[in-house]
């Protein structure tokens, strides 16, 4: 999915309000410095295209985080703010959200959510120049 | 059983304020959107606005702005529709309709309806 | 935005199939797959019979069929039956996050 014509402000808006309590709500316990940010990305579209992929592709070590509230959140965003998000996108995910049996928090999936902070961080100051 | 239930009939002055209530029950109520719609007597369906109980968002059809005003609380699964300033056009009846999960636009499941008659 | 235009009558004998268009611009039919088809008899509230275009949600008789070319939406009733008499409304997402621009409605009667 191309992510160029979505309403960045509007995702940003709702990312401060909600989605980023979630993260964190997620991380709780865990020290911000027990993780290395290893994914980056260059502006907007591409930061989407990263958390995309990180929140709702399963990895060795973390199965899905799709039924996890963030994970909820950022879709229904994506839905409203980029349009034909959902036409392209839902299908896949809900079946991921399907083949979940339970939610698991393990450590990869604790710094997968690590990355995903460090992205939407990155996603909330397009103007900084990449490190 | 899913369904949308609303508020009654209201009868109102010009220049005053309505608000109709929609009750949710049987589903998750925060995962969809709630629309609101309304239809003047013999006359088409027109969209006021929506509201997204998950992330918090409204949105308003562009001739209300201003005027109209979507709520949601969630502990009650409720949605709210409060228009102001009334006049004798905003004569309708007032429908919520639920939005589907993630595509917001299709509504499968509308209220009953609720008859808003504005008159001096 | 200025309302979908839809024609304000159809018709057609128990059997026979009626199609019903629905007609917009580039910002709402033509600039998205999000088109649907509610039906409405007198004093109660709209039906969902057509969503995505050319889905139907289940229970929806496979009478009901819709379709999309260019800016012009249809809904074909085929094999049309007394309980088909009622008001048909086309809807589309529009740009400006518009969820729900209608049409003015078509009366179909089943002659």
């Known amino acids: 999915y191309d992510f160029t014509n979505c309403d960045f402000e509007k995702i940003k808006a709702a990312y401060l309000s909600t989605i980023s309590k979630d993260l964190i709500t997620y991380m709780s316990g865990t020290k911000s410095t027990e993780f290395n940010n290893t994914v980056s990305c260059s502006n907007r579209p591409h930061c989407l295209t990263e958390i995309q992929s990180l929140t709702f592709n399963p990895t060795a070590g973390c199965a899905s985080l799709a039924k996890e509230m963030f994970a909820m959140k950022t879709k229904a965003a994506l839905a409203i703010w980029c349009p034909g998000y959902s036409e392209t996108q839902i299908n896949a995910t809900q079946a991921m959200k399907k083949a979940r049996k339970s939610k698991v928090t393990t450590n990869k999936c604790l710094e997968q959510v690590s990355q995903l902070q460090g992205l939407w961080r990155r996603f909330n100051r397009p103007l900084l120049k990449q490190q | 059983q899913v369904q949308l239930v609303q508020s009654g009939a209201e009868v109102k002055k010009p220049g005053s304020s309505v608000k109709v209530s929609c009750k949710a029950s049987g589903f998750t109520f925060g995962s969809y959107g709630i629309n609101w719609v309304r239809q003047a007597p013999g006359q088409g369906l027109e969209w006021l606005g929506v509201?997204?109980?998950?992330?918090?968002?409204?949105i308003y059809a562009e001739k209300f702005q201003g005027r109209v005003t979507i709520t949601a609380d969630t502990s009650t699964s409720t949605a709210y529709m409060e228009l102001s300033s009334l006049r004798s056009e905003d004569t309708a009846v007032y429908y919520c309709?639920?939005?589907?999960?993630?595509?917001?636009?299709?509504?499968?499941?509308w209220g009953q309806g609720t008859l808003v008659t504005v008159s001096s | 935005q200025s309302a979908l235009t839809q024609p304000p009558s159809a018709s057609g004998s128990p059997g026979q199939s009626v199609t019903i268009s629905c007609t917009g611009t580039?910002?709402?039919?033509?600039?998205?797959?999000?088109v649907s088809w509610y039906q409405q008899h007198p004093g109660k509230a709209p039906k969902l019979m057509i969503y995505g275009v050319s889905k139907r949600p289940s229970g929806v008789p496979d009478r009901f069929s819709g379709s999309k070319s260019g800016n012009t939406a249809s809904l074909t009733v085929s094999g049309l039956q007394a309980e088909d008499e009622a008001d048909y409304y086309c809807?589309?997402?529009?740009?400006?996050?518009?969820?729900?621009?209608f049409g003015g409605g078509t009366k179909l009667t089943v002659l």
């Open positions: 509201i997204v109980p998950l992330v918090g968002v409204t």
């Open positions: 309709a639920r939005g589907q999960e993630y595509f917001y636009w299709y509504f499968d499941l």
């Open positions: 809807s589309s997402y529009a740009s400006g996050h518009t969820f729900g621009l």
């Open positions: 580039s910002s709402d039919i033509g600039g998205y797959d999000r």
